[in-house]
């Protein structure tokens, strides 16, 4: 877009946005924050959804990878007129439902939720929000929270995956632009390359998976390398090493020349997967090479 940082990860990204009465005079800042962030997730395999909440949760834009639909979704988002209470759990309900139904036909795509709110949640509403965020997590989502102005950081740390998944914006709504870089860096899980990208047919290999965000998992012991072979069989392998910018994984033995393995990564023991355009292919290797 503007030469700024970008994310090439293929996953489902949900924005859950507070449109309660207290953000009435700050909706433009929220909109521009989402717009700037949305344009930086550039994988053709990335899908996005916009959900707003006040006294009700509403899905403004269902999950889509279509950039024209995303543009139209952003237009709808810009037109939102805030008002009502801060029923954050209603937003998470809409996200959980989409995660469940979108992934209940077989292949499970990883989900990342970025939830933004500006106020402290009263006791019951906090309980419901935490409960619904836990349901999203049970469905495999990674949950981040952006807190602006009068938020309660302790509450948001329990709604998000951890304290490290909370982005506090203490200087008011105009400071939202300042966290785009850090939220992009933290929420982006991407597979950029595999080394080697060509392996010998019938031989065992180790593959270095280059990328970002591999240690964003709630539990790094649950990170898996996944190889989708010839668009059919999927083999999951436990990595030998998990670092933020690379994984060291055993590659499956691919018996025949010309076989292709598309690289995926799971952050939750195979519950869902981050996809990529990275392919490992097999070639014939003569003895001694």
């Amino acid at each position: 877009e503007d030469g700024g940082p970008a994310c090439y990860g293929g996953f489902d990204l949900y924005f859950i946005l507070d449109k309660s009465g207290s953000v009435l005079h700050h909706w433009n800042e929220i909109y521009y924050f989402v717009e700037q962030l949305a344009h930086r997730f550039i994988s053709p395999q990335l899908r996005m959804s916009f959900i707003v909440f006040s006294t009700r949760g509403t899905t403004l834009m269902k999950l889509t990878e279509d950039r024209e639909q995303i543009r139209q979704g952003l237009e709808e988002l810009q037109k939102v007129l805030p008002g009502g209470d801060t029923y954050m759990h209603e937003g998470f309900e809409r996200a959980s439902e989409q995660i469940y139904y979108e992934n209940s036909q077989g292949y499970r795509t990883a989900s990342v939720i970025i939830a933004l709110t500006d106020g402290e949640l009263h006791e019951d509403l906090f309980f419901y929000s935490e409960r619904e965020a836990n349901r999203s997590r049970d469905l495999g989502a990674i949950v981040y929270c952006v807190g602006v102005k009068d938020f309660n950081e302790t509450q948001l740390a329990r709604i998000a995956d951890s304290k490290d998944h909370v982005f506090p914006v203490n200087d008011g709504f105009q400071a939202l632009q300042g966290i785009i870089h850090s939220i992009l860096k933290k929420s982006c899980i991407e597979i950029l390359a595999a080394e080697p990208s060509t392996i010998c047919a019938g031989e065992s290999f180790q593959v270095v998976v280059r990328g970002n965000g591999f240690r964003h998992a709630r539990n790094v012991d649950r990170v898996l390398c996944s190889f989708k072979i010839n668009d059919s069989v999927t083999l999951n392998e436990k990595p030998f090493a998990v670092e933020d910018t690379y994984l060291l994984c055993p590659a499956p033995i691919l018996k025949e020349v010309g076989m292709k393995a598309a690289l995926q990564v799971s952050m939750n023991d195979g519950l869902s997967f981050i996809s990529s355009s990275v392919i490992i292919t097999t070639t014939h290797c003569s003895d001694g090479s």
Epitope: E90, E97, Y101, G106
Partner: antibody, heavy 118, light 107 residues
Framework: EVQLVQSGGGLVKPGGSLRLSCAAS????????MNWVRQAPGKGLEWVSS????????YYADSVKGRFTISRDNAKNSLYLQMNSLRAEDTAVYYC???????????WGQGTLVTVSS | NIQMTQSPSSVSASVGDTVTISCRAS??????LGWYQQRPGEAPKLLIY???HLQSGVPSRFSGSGSGTDFVLTITSLQPEDFATYYC?????????FGGGTKLEIK
């Protein structure tokens, strides 16, 4: 009190139609997905159909696909099952059930008997 | 489509006994499995969700375990009201599927 009250069952001839209703009360109906499940006399439970909270996602069992239609009216807190081209093997007690996917069906209607016979 | 197989189809036990009912999925379903109790003439009742979580209001003598393809419902210290039919159900993917049921009878 959270409850689901069913109506619309009865005796119908093969090839006929019937519409089942399920009225919800005591909870925010528009926030929940809903299911229809049936049980033939003396048999086990069989899932029939599911609908998401805003009707965006709808699924049917192969045995009823093309003949049954699930729908809901959130303004009326009601769930429906329109059953067309009924067959003898559709004879069963039909239950509506509230669901929070993927946590299971936590509230059930009392059931309504549909008998398909000439 | 995922098939759910329950065993045994029926079991006899006495008040105070412990019983276990098994459920096997034809393919992995993570932990998206529920257990239901159905008494004669009544609607089913959710006992356990997500394989091991006790539904609110259900006595702690009911417990569930398992993940992937193999699951177990355990009822300890059987009470007279526990004699009923039990069903497992997968919610991992559509079409949703129930097991064939296990009838728990008084010995």
């Amino acid at each position: 009190e959270v409850q689901l009250v069913q109506s619309g069952g009865g005796l119908v001839k093969p090839g006929g139609s019937l519409r089942l209703s399920c009225a919800a009360s005591g909870f925010t109906f528009s926030s929940y997905s809903m299911n229809w499940v049936r049980q033939a006399p003396g048999k086990g439970l069989e899932w029939v159909s599911s609908i998401s909270s805003s009707s965006s996602y709808i699924y049917y069992a192969d045995s009823v696909k093309g003949r049954f239609t699930i729908s809901r009216d959130n303004a009326k807190n009601s769930l429906y099952l329109q059953m067309n081209s009924l067959r003898a093997e559709d004879t069963a007690v039909y239950y509506c059930a509230r669901v929070r996917p993927p946590y299971g069906m936590d509230v059930w209607g009392q059931g309504t008997l549909v008998t398909v016979s000439s | 489509n995922i098939q759910m197989t329950q065993s045994p189809s029926s079991v006899s036990a006495s008040v105070g006994d412990t019983v276990t009912i098994s459920c096997r999925a034809s393919q992995g379903i993570s932990n998206w499995l529920g257990w239901y109790q159905q008494r004669p003439g009544e609607a089913p009742k959710l006992l356990i969700y997500a394989a091991s979580h006790l539904q609110s209001g259900v006595p702690s003598r009911f417990s569930g375990s398992g993940s992937g393809t193999d699951f177990v419902l355990t009822i300890t210290s059987l009470q007279p009201e526990d004699f009923a039919t039990y069903y497992c159900q997968q919610s991992n993917s559509f079409p949703l599927a129930f097991g064939g049921g296990t009838k728990l009878e008084i010995k």
